[in-house]
């Protein structure tokens, strides 16, 4: 397969230049006031110095304003997620205006030149800003630029430029390549904007990563990890078109930050909560699911502005598609025993059974390893509301799914053939909800068998005293 | 109305040259894409390449590269299509049709289409 | 390049019948909800005739005999009841990506 280099293309196209033509091409940068929710409404041009445009074209002076920036184009045509995102911010802010930076011929290019076209898109967004602001009531905190891949650095120069401060960035998956540890000034970052948020959704430690990995903005979320989107695999998009490439799993890893901004658009009832993380590893953990002072936010249109002295970076799990919500549980699970574990770590499930519905069976990921005499911590997470819980079954696997766990066993057999049977010990486990910071304490149904072993199950009901809240806040932020 | 309208027909020699234009009207000429479409003799429609009317860049489909030119005048609201060394298989109606910026890109208006006979 | 495969060929209704035309995709043609077909009518010796996009959306002025539907790689135009002056090439077109492609026509003769 080829490999993949943006967000529709692969590294030896960027190569190639589009054909240069006869006719004289002007460096462009349109702004096209969207006045229809029709997509296919030609809308309204603005440029600085023209006034009759905003009149004929009913542009809300007092209003809030949208500036959608897209990236880089290898078609030179709008990318399909550019009137998803126009339609969404119409539905939802009706009075609002919605205007598409349209730098296509500065961007249909290659990719090194396109880079280095952002600053001067930077600049023509900035000029149009600065003329505006000569109007009466227009007021810049009432801008949100929203830029995507490229666009989110373009944000950052027009931000940077303006006169005054812009109310908002949202950078979506902001390109990686050559902005990667670039300097402040060099790339969007928290000075651009009073508020600056930003959705990382295709960041790669290995290879080439098409979003940037470091965090850029005041608060930075990585959906599940900001790298494998759900959905997005290759078995995903080969099951959607016929001749599925890598390039088709890049364009929808890096896509998918465009897609979370409309849900929260659109869904609003919905919202999805991130949580402030060091990495994704202790996320995956289950380590951090608290809201306190600040530590968790609606992720997308709905986040609440935070201006932290350090870059927050923040993480959650989403579905695979729209409602992207899910439902996170921090599990605790204190093994007080162990038996003849072996080499090998265990593999556990875990339904559970609240007041709305019970979860399909969830595999508990180990990320290091099962501690004795320890409380090990766990992330589940549920697409569906299970209310509030009930009881949890909790499930040892029996045979090995793995041939490397299933080579370790046969090796433990053979170095100690009458081993007698695995056998772990549990009492009780606590269990957070992320959505509503609820504290739950679930014992063993038989506080006499709190043990199990491979291919059986335990399970566990409200402790008598186990319904805690503890006095934290809830991630139910204040819509803007 | 929104109109395109074509340059008539031409017969040219092999090895010539021919420009074909497309004059438009009732809407600004700037605000849509200008695709070129060919039709041979009995034959379906081939889509040839498109031209941004605003920045002057064209973009040519992989059989049309080369000796096919698109350019504009934007002053007289007309594109252009140039065939340089033609062949006997360059013989086709050459249609122009407008399609948004925006949304599913359709092309909504056509011209009449322009017919080139190449023979000796 | 999307591959358009329209079936049949051509077709031979008697007025008042239904015509009924399909376009196969060699991939989605979706973007979300979205589907990026449209239909043209090509008379002879004229320029294509936008009908139908979006897949089932009626262009302006076009008789409400003409109704397109499908989704994802399959799609349909059904003409309903058919009329004389229906007599045309009508050719599938995808928008979702360029180059856009045209489905290789049928020819619909009314008997």
């Known amino acids: 397969s080829p490999v993949p280099f943006g967000p529709e293309g692969r590294l030896e196209d960027k190569l190639h230049k589009p054909k240069a033509t006869q006719t004289e091409v002007k460096p462009s940068v349109r702004f096209n006031l969207r006045t229809s929710k029709d997509p296919e409404h030609e809308g309204c041009y603005l440029s600085v110095g023209h006034s009759q445009p905003l009149e004929d074209c009913s542009f809300n002076m007092t209003a809030k304003t949208f500036f959608i920036i897209h990236g880089w184009t290898m078609s030179g045509i709008f990318e399909n997620w550019l009137h998803k995102l126009v339609s969404a911010l119409h539905t939802r802010e009706k009075d609002a205006n919605v205007v598409v930076v349209d730098w296509l011929p500065l961007a249909h290019q290659l990719y090194t030149d396109a880079v280095n076209n952002t600053r001067v898109v930077g600049h023509s967004i900035a000029r149009m800003l600065d003329w505006l602001q000569e109007k009466d009531d227009f007021s810049l905190g009432n801008v949100h630029l929203i830029g995507y891949s490229l666009g989110a650095h373009v944000a950052g120069y027009a931000g940077n430029f303006v006169k005054g401060t812009v109310g908002r960035i949202t950078g979506l998956d902001p390109a990686g390549p050559m902005f990667e540890g670039a300097d402040i000034h060099k790339r969007l970052s928290p000075d651009d904007a009073d508020f600056v948020d930003v959705l990382h959704t295709y960041t790669r430690s290995f290879g080439l990563s098409i979003g940037i990995q470091m965090p850029v903005g005041h608060i930075d979320i990585y959906p599940n990890g900001g790298d494998f989107q759900p959905g997005c695999g290759l078995n995903d998009v080969l099951g959607s078109i016929a001749y599925g490439t890598i390039t088709e799993v890049v364009k929808c890893e890096h896509e998918r930050a465009v897609h979370l901004f409309v849900d929260s658009l659109v869904n609003q009832d919905k919202p999805s909560f991130a949580f402030q993380c060091t990495d994704s590893n202790r996320f995956k953990k289950g380590i951090c699911l608290s809201c306190r002072k600040n530590r968790c936010n609606s992720i997308g249109y709905n986040a609440k502005k935070m201006r932290n002295k350090r870059n927050s970076k923040m993480y959650l799990k989403t579905r695979a598609g729209m409602p992207f919500r899910v439902y996170h549980y921090q599990m605790k699970i204190h093994v007080f025993s162990y038996k003849n574990m072996g080499e090998i770590e265990p593999t556990f499930y875990v339904t559970l059974y609240g007041t709305n519905a019970d979860s399909q069976t969830l595999p508990l990921e180990i990320v290091e390893r099962i501690e004795q005499n320890a409380t090990n911590t766990f992330l589940v997470y549920t697409e569906e509301d299970l209310g509030d819980l009930l009881k949890i079954q909790l499930t040892w696997e029996g045979a090995s799914q793995s041939w490397y766990n299933l080579w370790k066993e046969f090796r433990s057999y053979l170095s100690q053939p009458r081993n007698p049977g695995r056998e772990l010990n549990i009492r009780r486990i606590r269990v957070k909800s992320g959505e509503t910071q609820r504290k739950l304490t679930f014992c063993t149904e038989d506080p006499e068998n709190t043990s199990i072993s491979p291919g059986r199950e335990l399970w566990f009901r409200k402790c008598r005293d186990g319904w805690r809240m503890k006095n934290e806040t809830s991630p139910t932020v204040e819509l803007p | 109305q929104v109109q395109l309208v074509q340059s008539g027909s031409e017969l040219k020699k092999p090895g010539a040259s021919v420009k074909v234009s497309c004059k438009a009207s009732?809407?600004?000429?700037?605000?849509?894409?200008m695709n070129w479409v060919r039709q041979a003799p009995g034959q379906g429609l081939e889509w040839m390449g498109w031209?941004?009317?605003?920045?002057?860049?064209?973009t040519y489909a992989g059989d049309f590269k080369g000796r096919f030119v698109f350019s504009l005048d934007t002053s007289v609201s007309t594109a252009y299509l140039q065939i340089s060394s033609l062949k006997a298989e360059d013989t086709a109606v050459y249609y122009c049709?407008?399609?948004?910026?925006?949304?599913?890109?359709?092309?909504?208006?056509w011209g009449k289409g322009t017919t080139v006979t190449v023979s000796s | 390049d999307i591959v358009l495969t329209q079936s049949p060929a051509s077709l031979a209704v008697s007025p008042g019948q239904r015509a009924t035309i399909t376009c196969k995709a060699s991939?989605?043609?979706?973007?979300?909800?979205?589907?990026?077909m449209h239909w043209y009518q090509q008379k002879p010796g004229q320029p294509p005739k936008l009908l139908i996009y979006?897949?089932?959306n009626l262009a302006s002025g076009v008789p409400a005999r003409f109704s397109g539907s499908g989704s994802g790689t399959d799609f349909t135009l059904t003409i309903n009841p058919v009329e004389a002056n229906d007599t045309a090439n009508y050719y599938c077109?995808?928008?979702?990506?360029?180059?856009?492609?045209f489905g290789g026509g049928t020819k619909v003769e009314i008997k």
């Open positions: 031209i941004n009317t605003y920045s002057g860049v064209p």
């Open positions: 009732g809407y600004t000429f700037t605000n849509y894409g």
């Open positions: 991939q989605s043609v979706d973007y979300d909800v979205d589907s990026y």
């Open positions: 979006a897949a089932s």
């Open positions: 077109q995808q928008t979702i990506e360029d180059p856009p492609t």
């Open positions: 049709a407008r399609r948004g910026y925006y949304g599913r890109r359709y092309f909504d208006v």
